[in-house]
């Protein structure tokens, strides 16, 4: 039997303090590097062990980052997004979108643009 995958999308403000080795995560996405079909957003692809993000514990792989220090990440080239993080200063505020799988219903399929695929 096919199961429908439902998601709960939540947003959270995460304040990180840049550590000795930086913020401690990798990103994918951008207008020139679409990670999810029809979505040029910026996604977290890796949380580095013992980095600032890992020690904080709230940012997760697969999260979409909506803004950095209030600056929207929409319609940015990949490298411009990277540069934005690198120049964000010591205290960095991230607005992130978590996407949690919550239920398997009776019918349906996962969409083509699912970032967890």
């Amino acid at each position: 039997m096919n199961g429908r995958v439902d998601y709960l999308v939540t947003e959270e403000e995460i304040n990180l303090t840049r550590g000795p080795s930086g913020l401690g995560f990798n990103i994918v996405g951008g207008t020139d590097q679409q990670y999810v079909s029809n979505d040029s957003g910026i996604y977290v692809s890796r949380i580095k062990e013992n980095g600032a993000a890992a020690l904080d514990g709230r940012l997760q792989e697969g999260d979409k980052i909506l803004s950095v220090n209030g600056q929207d990440l929409k319609n940015l080239l990949h490298q411009d997004a990277v540069d934005l993080f690198r120049n964000a200063g010591y205290a960095v505020s991230l607005r992130v979108q978590h996407r949690l799988q919550v239920q398997n219903g009776p019918i349906g399929h996962r969409g083509e643009g699912d970032p967890s695929g």
Epitope: S21, G22, L23, G24, F25, N26, I27, V28, G29, D32, Q33, Y35, V44, S45, R46, K48, H78, Q79, V82, F85, R86
Partner: nanobody
């Protein structure tokens, strides 16, 4: 997970050339940042070269600059290392490595801990 398969190694005389290939699985190859490392018997793993996701940024160890060229073909899910003017000291097992995405911090290209996945390696032997 990402699988990496290297090929192209072999035995070559000093001054000769080889071209190594690294094929990576996964539909998001174009988001990978990638590198080549090598390990000679009894020595630590050593950084050789790095290439960014689009292929526009490359970095090399001083010992191979001007002789080795790293490149990638995102349509073929493949990274290459063209090795010219080979020397006996280039003899080693060559490994390709992948990091998923770009670090938001200054990238330490030569640090093996920056990479998430590793191939099994291909042997390169350069004879006198």
């Amino acid at each position: 997970d990402v699988q990496l398969v290297e090929s192209g190694g072999g035995l070559v005389q000093a001054g000769g050339s080889l071209r190594l290939s690294c094929v990576a699985s996964g539909r998001t190859f174009s988001t990978y940042t990638m590198g080549w490392f090598r390990q000679a018997p009894g020595k630590e793993r050593e950084f050789v070269a790095h290439i960014g996701w689009s292929g526009s940024s490359t970095y090399y160890a001083d010992s191979v600059k001007g002789r080795f060229t790293i490149s990638r073909d995102n349509a073929k899910n493949t990274m290459y290392l063209q090795m010219n003017s080979l020397k006996p000291e280039d003899t080693a097992v060559y490994y390709c490595a992948v990091a998923i995405g770009s670090p938001v911090d200054s990238y330490r290209h030569s640090d093996p801990l920056e990479y998430d996945y590793w191939g099994q390696g291909t042997q390169v032997t350069v004879s006198e």
